[in-house]
Amino acid sequence: SIPWNLERITPARYRADEYQPPKGGSLVEVYLLDTGIQSDHREIEGRVMVTDFESVPEEDGTRFHRQASKCDSHGTHLAGVVSGRDAGVAKGAGLRSLRVLNCQGKGTVSGTLIGLEFIRKSQLVQPVGPLVVLLPLAGGYSRVFNAACQRLARAGVVLVTAAGNFRDDACLYSPASAPEVITVGATNAQDQPVTLGTLGTNFGRCVDLFAPGEDIIGASSDCSTCFVSRSGTSQAAAHVAGIAAMMLSAEPELTLAELRQRLIHFSAKDVINEAWFPEDQRVLTPNLVAALPPSTHRAGWQLFCRTVWSAHSGPTRMATAVARCAQDEELLSCSSFSRSGKRRGERIEAQGGKRVCRAHNAFGGEGVYAIARCCLLPQVNCSVHTAPPAGASMGTRVHCHQQGHVLTGCSSHWEVEDLGTHKPPVLRPRGQPNQCVGHREASIHASCCHAPGLECKVKEHGIPAPQEQVIVACEDGWTLTGCSALPGTSHVLGAYAVDNTCVVRSWDVSTTGSTSEEAVAAVAICCRSRHLVQASQELQ
Amino acid sequence: QEDEDGDYEELVLALRSEEDGLADAPEHGATATFHRCAKDPWRLPGTYVVVLKEETHRSQSERTARRLQAQAARRGYLTKILHVFHHLLPGFLVKMSGDLLELALKLPHVDYIEEDSSVFAQ
């Protein structure tokens, strides 16, 4: 039947049998670092170039027999998923294969590094159009592997990798943990994370998105017309490499940051059953399944934002956690979250010429996360305005006072170990949209930005009695840039953005015996760029 | 995805000793670090990626590799330079005894050294 995976990545408004993708990735070269491939398979014949690159370790075991069809099975299948005639995602994309995995599917970090260098050298010798590098492999966390990926990404190459099949935190593996790499987890036809024997897809904050990765039909190296179904995060990564090739064919000038934001934007949201993930990983793992954009879509006018979680700070008293945006992204807001509720807030800092989001643990806390809201906004110029603790009952307030600057995010940070309940409750003054308000004992930080045509508005949702979760979402056409809690009472665990929704989490009320005075409000800052909208209208 | 926060083993060697009286030995107190895979069965001891500091001139990779070989030979160790990196990271891949790590970490321009490890099809 129509492969479920191709149906799943079809844009929502189309039926799979009606959708004919544009160009099919023909302007893009996809490099595949894997086993050998059977280049004369009907599915990929004529669209694959087998390079002379080979850097593989010896096979284990004295009785191992090299059998061509077995040696090439993994790579052949993935090549078919990326650009196969019948079952491929980007049917027009060209492929170049480098052999870095032996017949047992095993390679080395060093061999793969040499492969990445080969690609960079080829790019320097003969610059072509956009390049996508597919790394359907994983090893333990490697500083050098991640560093090499960072360098290649900064040279304009899009790297896509498998999250790993270890049912574990993807941050413990490379290249999955490299921030510049697009890391892909695997889901099945039921939108469940894929189980593989006793293991399964990796998860966590190092995963960018998920894609189909179970029972994926693709070319088999058993014969030139055979197909097999295989499962794994490699198959998922191959889908995203194909989607990336399609997007880059439609818009060859896209940067890595723009491509990643588009992949996230066009993904199906909140369809994965998160119960499969360990409880502590659910909030960190993106609930996104990759999909192709609608064929005519040039999304340049959109204000794109994504949420980036830091590593956990650890439990020491002065521990901090730092979340960073990618090179071409702007950090528009910063929030924090602690499962124990013991934290001392967060603030935006400058580090190496870039803004970062730093969260602070509190005494007795189990640790914190910093959460950055990272956006694509051309010609943006941002600054942070800080108000020290007011000490007054009305709370601490700060606003954007520079002309043309709008409020994109509010953060609060406090030195006291326990902020306590704010009485009377902090209220936002009406008619002052460019103002952050917070607890009287906290410093309040306003992220104020100027960009052509940028407009923002504050949207609040308050609940009189405490709730475990309070949410507020931005309307269509507006993008969530900031998410914070008001007033930041002692039972607030933190705030974070999920897609276009601001989530404020509090203690389970039944266990804490909080009073009804401790109201919680979620504060969303929603922005759009009139400049980008106008530019898109002029294009049309 | 935070690079520096990965859960891997890091062995930091503080280098305060003079190495063979080399004129361009690292300045007092400079440290290079050694990394290896946290998953023991995936380790490949005996092969190491020596990564030089970012601003290192490309000619330094060969020079540092030759210096390592010479100093190792003086101690009776054979080493083999398997690859010199130029286009992504300054550095080189070397096959050598783990006994030489302390020596290699003291070489000028060295940022860190990582033991090779396995990767697997997913």
Epitope: A16, D17, Q20, A189, E214, S220, V228, S229 | -
Partner: antibody
Framework: EVQLVESGGGLVQPGGSLRLSCAAS????????MNWVRQAPGKGLDWVST????????NYADSVKGRFIISRDSSKHTLYLQMNSLRAEDTAVYYC???????????WGRGTLVTVSS | DIVMTQSPDSLAVSLGERATINCKSS????????????LGWYQQKPGQPPNLLIY???TRESGVPDRFSGSGSGTDFTLTISSLQAEDVAVYYC?????????FGQGTKLEIK
Amino acid sequence: EVQLVESGGGLVQPGGSLRLSCAASGFTFNNYAMNWVRQAPGKGLDWVSTISGSGGTTNYADSVKGRFIISRDSSKHTLYLQMNSLRAEDTAVYYCAKDSNWGNFDLWGRGTLVTVSS
Amino acid sequence: DIVMTQSPDSLAVSLGERATINCKSSQSVLYRSNNRNFLGWYQQKPGQPPNLLIYWASTRESGVPDRFSGSGSGTDFTLTISSLQAEDVAVYYCQQYYTTPYTFGQGTKLEIK
């Protein structure tokens, strides 16, 4: 040798149960979807059920939904069909068929006869 | 469900002559993404299981003699045996595998005249 061998057929009373097995050999079992197709005496072919290579996805014909369960054991390279609440109209030769992975059947077993009668 | 209708129900053809069997689907089985018709043809000889002859409406399965050919697209398909041999006596079925439930035609019995 690439082959499929069915077993487990026989005579059963209406309302009874039966479990069919299909032993696969000569190919990588978990790389292929598998199917059960039946043929009533003197009649045409009737698809019953399919299971994906991983076992994660199953589909059934409306006539057997809720009564039959398809499953597979990749360690034993065996496909199963658990048939419950059997009716007279389930009487047929049941074939196990390997899927090309597109939905057509490129390898068939010789079949096992199931007779539902009182 | 997609209904498959074959014609004729039975057919008698002389040895060496051409035999043509038609199959019509109640909706298109053409998948635009790869331009393939999800239609197969099977041969079933008495006392034997079916055997795949043609897939993708026109691609011969390996080992199938080249006198068998398939054609058609969308909803109308044809199986042709260019020169009938004695061993071709069988019942022939078309099958759509575009979507589940997979459905077969009622079969066409081919005999020698």
